[in-house]
């Protein structure tokens, strides 16, 4: 039975009965705000295998595991997300483990597991087996792992039942609970799912199947479901619906959903039954179910009740899909996100006109504004204080506004303001002044030449390397001495270097927004002798590792024709020499007879060169009877120190301050104080948490029904 269009279970745990016959929830599942601790053991929904949108759990007292409720939940498709997330577990006071031992695939979106004071078995789940990208998962403020004592099945008895994978260089057993392993399919299946007996499913199956190589035995479908079969595409006279199944024209014609009630009904376009015609198309007549291409962009006026629309996530951008004219102001505040540029372009790429102002601030996830690919007019009918209609503040990774060679943007009224955009060259801003017709409107402080582009390459001259020398952990490089028109303007050089396994890095790498600069920086003073070429010894490097290196001249700000001059090199790729490898990992030995030992190991994590052979040494040792006196693995021997309070554990979010032994007789050093950048990152992290929490509360707290 398909249940839909989204199930909201709140206040009364007995509402869970609504899930009784559901095999697929076409939409979301909310279980929330059940404040009285109940016994959930009698509630079990083994039929539920798929949720097409997202699963949200919030403040459900007494619920200790999801495994008993949803033992067969296999796929969360994430067709629509809750603030970029397909699985949200937030403030679940009694939840001890997630326990969704059959969950094999989250097709789209990330997970957010936060402020669950008693929640363990988080570090034992390998989310990379379930999600495509784990970088946007947010798992914070749960029970500290060291207080959990998570043991996978069989570990205590020294008969581990679960498989191992590597997460953050830690090779460990993967499980959901003390008695449920995380299922992994044989490598022979490739990306295919598998049965409980490790037989490979049909390629059209997703998550699992009840019989091998059978497209009618899938638990969920990789593409579409029709008449009991998983199909790669919907058959003739049927149409894709909600991203997972095929429906006929009559079904599509009759849909009356709360979301679409104001529209003229669903349409069929490009083989899909959808709420509206997609970008670039319009209905073929007011009541038609079919779409035709627009001549030029289709007109769609969108208005924001509150005048200012805040875009702080994919979800908020979704509201603007198809809009060509936005009546109001746009405030863009994108701190993080997966594949954010293409998602924003998908939802905001048709906007041509903004009647008010556009403000972009703290959008560290943005590298460019090109996602507003059709924006051609900012009217500035409403302006920010100071008469600004285009305002760009503190965007740590913004490097490009638009491609001005292919962009015609007019700002009809109002000024522009740019500050604290360290990777945005001032030349790019000046170009925008010319294109938009705002040149002359800005006063001197409106475009800050000191803190815009300060960390960008806005140079015009090229520095050339003259020599490179390598050892196992050092690189020595020299380059031509740069001679600016006025030699006094050259202050020093900055060398940027980073590991680069492939020769494909750019200066802006590692800033795919959502991250700080990934380059290491070293300042190099000018050699006193004018005939000596500047150079540097980079030390503390890894053996047999390719590095990317480039150099920038640090000059006084010299404005020539309104452009800042300077110099930098091309990126140079250079590999350090080989060295002794690190120790082999996971050495295991077992005896298969009275005179033989079988020894297995994994390659070293740092080969430091091309491995050619291993040396195995062994020696006889006396038996130590003391080792057998205690069972160190016994679960009840693990000290449980304190009950986590569900607040953010500082140790989780930031590294422990490390004490280092310094040279000579100095003794241990103090931990370094946090840098401004670290403090700023923590502040932004806290801000991001608040934004999410506000979004959560605004979404789920609704007036009581009549």
């Amino acid at each position: 039975e398909i249940c839909g269009p989204g199930i909201d279970i709140r206040n009364d745990y007995q509402q869970l009965k609504r899930l009784e016959n559901c095999t697929v929830i076409e939409g979301y599942l909310h279980i929330l705000l059940i404040s009285k601790a109940e016994d959930y053991r009698s509630y079990r929904f083994p039929k539920l295998t798929v949720i097409t949108e997202y699963l949200l759990l919030f403040r459900v007292a007494g619920l200790e595991s999801l495994g008993d409720l949803f033992p067969n939940l296999t796929v969360i498709r994430g067709w629509k997300l809750f603030y970029n997330y397909a699985l949200v577990i937030f403030e679940m006071t009694n939840l001890k483990d997630i326990g969704l031992y059959n969950l094999r695939n989250i097709t789209r979106g990330a997970i957010r597991i936060e402020k669950n004071a008693d929640l363990c078995y988080l570090s034992t789940v390998d989310w990379s087996l379930i999600l495509d990208a784990v970088s946007n998962n947010y798992i914070v403020g749960n029970k500290p792992p060291k207080e959990c004592g998570d043991l996978c099945p069989g570990t205590m008895e020294e008969k581990p039942m679960c498989e191992k994978t590597t997460i953050n260089n830690e090779y460990n057993y993967r499980c959901w609970t003390t008695n449920r392993c995380q299922k992994m399919c044989p490598s022979t299946c490739g990306k295919r799912a598998c049965t409980e007996n490790n037989e490979c499913c049909h390629p059209e199956c997703l998550g699992s199947c009840s019989a091998p190589d059978n497209d009618t035995a899938c638990v969920a479908c990789r593409h579409y479901y029709y008449a009991g079969v998983c199909v790669p595409a919907c058959p003739p006279n049927t149409y894709r619906f909600e991203g997972w199944r095929c429906v006929d024209r009559d079904f599509c014609a009759n849909i009356l959903s709360a979301e679409s009630s104001d529209s003229e009904g669903f349409v069929i376009h490009d083989g899909e039954c959808m709420q509206e015609c997609p970008s670039g198309f319009i209905r073929n007549g007011s009541q038609s179910m079919y779409c035709i291409p627009c001549e030029g962009p289709c007109p769609k006026v969108c208005e924001e009740e509150k005048k200012t629309k805040t875009i702080d996530s994919v979800t908020s951008a979704q509201m603007l899909q198809g809009c060509t004219i936005f009546k109001g102001n746009l405030l863009i505040n994108i701190r993080r996100g997966n594949n954010i540029a293409s998602e924003l372009e998908n939802f905001m790429g048709l906007i041509e006109v903004v009647t008010g102002y556009v403000k972009i601030r703290h959008s560290h996830a943005l590298v460019s504004l090109s996602f507003l690919k059709n924006l051609r007019l900012i009217l500035g009918e409403e302006q920010l204080e100071g008469n600004y209609s285009f305002y760009v503040l503190d965007n740590q990774n913004l490097q490009q506004l638009w491609d001005w060679d292919h962009r015609n943007l007019t700002i009809k009224a109002g000024k522009m303001y740019f500050a604290f955009n360290p990777k945005l060259c001032v030349s790019e801003i000046y170009r925008m002044e010319e294109v938009t017709g705002t040149k002359g409107r800005q006063s001197k402080g409106d475009i800050n030449t000191r803190n815009n582009g300060e960390r960008a390459s806005c140079e015009s001259d090229v520095l050339h390397f003259t020599s490179t020398t390598t050892s196992k952990n050092r690189i020595i490089i020299t380059w031509h001495r740069y001679r600016p028109p006025d030699y006094r303007d050259l202050i020093s050089f900055t060398v940027y270097y980073k590991e680069a396994p492939f020769k494909n890095v750019t200066e802006y790498d590692g800033q795919d927004a959502c991250g700080s600069n990934s380059w290491n920086m070293v300042d190099v003073d000018l050699p006193p002798n004018k005939d000596v070429e500047p150079g540097i010894l980079l030390h503390g490097l890894k053996p047999w590792t390719q590095y990317a290196v480039y150099v920038k001249a640090v000059t006084l700000t010299m404005v020539e024709n309104d452009h800042i001059r300077g110099a930098k090199s091309e990126i140079l790729y250079i590999r350090t020499n080989a060295s002794v490898p690190s120790i082999p990992l996971d050495v295991l030995s077992a005896s298969n007879s009275s005179s033989q030992l079988i020894v297995k190991w994994n390659p070293p994590s740092l080969p430091n060169g091309n491995l050619s052979y291993y040396i195995v040494r062994w020696q006889r040792q006396p038996q130590d009877g003391y080792l057998y006196r205690h069972n160190y693995c016994s679960k009840d021997k693990i000290p449980i120190r304190k009950y986590a309070d569900g607040t953010i554990d500082i140790e989780e979010v930031t590294e422990n301050p490390k004490t280092e032994v310094c040279g000579g007789e100095k003794g241990p050093c103090c931990a370094c104080p946090k840098t401004e950048a670290e403090k700023q990152a923590e502040k932004e992290e806290a801000e991001y948490r608040k934004v999410f929490e506000n979004f959560l509360h605004n979404s789920i707290f609704v007036p009581r029904p009549e």
Epitope: E1, P5, G6, A253, N254, I255, L256, S257, A258
Partner: antibody, heavy 117, light 112 residues
Framework: QVQLQESGPGLVKPSETLSLTCTVS?????????WNWIRQPPGKGLEWIGY???????NYKPSLKDRVTISRDTSKNQFSLKLSSVTAADTAVYYC??????????WGQGTLVTVSS | DIVMTQSPLSLPVTPGEPASISCRSS???????????LQWYLQKPGQSPQLLIY???NRLYGVPDRFSGSGSGTDFTLKISRVEAEDVGVYYC?????????FGQGTKVEIK
Amino acid sequence: QVQLQESGPGLVKPSETLSLTCTVSGYSITGGYLWNWIRQPPGKGLEWIGYISYDGTNNYKPSLKDRVTISRDTSKNQFSLKLSSVTAADTAVYYCARYGRVFFDYWGQGTLVTVSS
Amino acid sequence: DIVMTQSPLSLPVTPGEPASISCRSSQSIVHSNGNTYLQWYLQKPGQSPQLLIYKVSNRLYGVPDRFSGSGSGTDFTLKISRVEAEDVGVYYCFQGSHVPHTFGQGTKVEIK
């Protein structure tokens, strides 16, 4: 996959109130569609009584408006019919049905209510 | 209220022969959006009604192509090109364009 099931007393005394409940499974009544009551006196045709929409708004047949109330219980995913001051003329098979943008796509199997003393 | 009048009220048919049912509305049932929400339902003995045709002429997926609907404004027709034994039952027209929605009084189709 969507199922509607009528329930309620099969016998009601004249002048009393007829009360029926339709339990919906497979679709949330707040998610969309119009949730209707239709009746059919024995050997006669179908008569539309009224509906409650996904947002809780009602529409009734004018000739029954003074006696009819359609309400819902979203927590149980049910909607109900109350018909007051019943007479023998209200004896019928009562159906609940879901109406979309264009047509009735799901019907209950119907329940016979007899008005008799 | 819009009154929907069907004729004939009873229609004895021979299998393999065509049949036609008329439905007239007391006023136009064209909705303000331009659509005409007229449907035809068949109620077989002891069963709930089932949809055959919607919006005057759209045959529901899975309904045999011997059934067809036509008409506009106030005059509508359901045709069965070759009646089969399984087609017996009461046929109702229904208008959903204006509230209150109304059914026709029904046409009983039976085999001669």
